[in-house]
Amino acid sequence: KSEMPQPVSIQDINHRVWVLQDQILIAVPRKDRVSPVTISLISCRHVETLEKDRGNPIYLGLNGLNLCLMCAKAGDQPTLQLKEKDIMDLYNQPEPVKSFLFYHSQSGRNSTFESVAFPGWFIAVSSEGGCPLILTQELGKANTTDFGLTMLF
């Protein structure tokens, strides 16, 4: 099991990258002057206590920024949020911190990220550019839930 976060770059199938704007992650077309965030991911060390068939449970952080992705309910709808948090603090906790965990599932070159706290809800971007990352249950045309990962360093 890796004990160091793995830096990755993420883009969707429409070649949009993730950028940080006012503490919100948005997906924008890759251009010269766009500086995408580097994502850190690390597997949960308590993998034996989580469902085995949904993917690899991981924490997702923004490299060097002490921000991590989490899912929380706003009203009765799960939402994707950025929380000030050291990814290694989450990794070292004595139990899986489900609100910060995602099942990372790979099919060929495509990756999906399903919330552990809210099964059936996936990280997604709207098919229109320049929109914030969201959580969705609808794996259809309106939202993109498939992403490509490139390992860095």
Partner: antibody, heavy 121, light 109 residues
Framework: EVQLQQSGAELVKPGASVKLSCTAS????????IYWVKQRPEQGLEWIGR????????RYDPKFQGKATMTADTSSNTAYLQLSSLTSEDTAVYYC??????????????WGQGTTLTVSS | QAVVTQESALTTSPGETVTLTCRSS?????????ANWVQEKPDHLFTGLIG???NRAPGVPARFSGSLIGDKAALTITGAQTEDEAIYFC?????????FGGGTKLTVL
Amino acid sequence: EVQLQQSGAELVKPGASVKLSCTASGFNIKDTYIYWVKQRPEQGLEWIGRIDPANGYTRYDPKFQGKATMTADTSSNTAYLQLSSLTSEDTAVYYCARYEYYDSSFYFDYWGQGTTLTVSS
Amino acid sequence: QAVVTQESALTTSPGETVTLTCRSSTGAVTTSNYANWVQEKPDHLFTGLIGGTNNRAPGVPARFSGSLIGDKAALTITGAQTEDEAIYFCALWYSNHLVFGGGTKLTVL
């Protein structure tokens, strides 16, 4: 209001089994971890184990492996502890507790009132 | 299996500062043991006070604080009150299992 309500006192014979319950109100047990703890008269606490009611996965203290079985029923919002092959050593108060993550750590934030188990012939 | 040891009893006076400690048989307690502190009052009333060595649980008064002192986990009550009379248990994580101490009976006279 968040509460953990445990089943009533039990008097059982050596060699028998017993199933204790812990019913949650004010929250959904599948959103947290439920821990079980044993307290013998004039002694400290012993961790029996924990269950994640969302998936049924458990962790046991090695000492209680084979003695205790934890289960959960999310439809009734209830966690269970079954104890088998009972002896006088199992005479104790058994507690369920919620182990919850807030902000930066896990805490035991709510406890049941305890179930007194007496094993006697 | 690890053994967690606490003072069996301590006495303090209202307004005084008192420190309870928690020792591990396996060596120094570190932040990796994620020390928890729990208070037991009469009639089986338990309250979680501290998690992750030094993080106060929501709603717990600021007079309770957790730390590491030397090779032990510690719970300090700054300005003890009569209602703090109780038994205090620490619990330490060892990999994937939790071990409780025997408890400290705190008397506030």
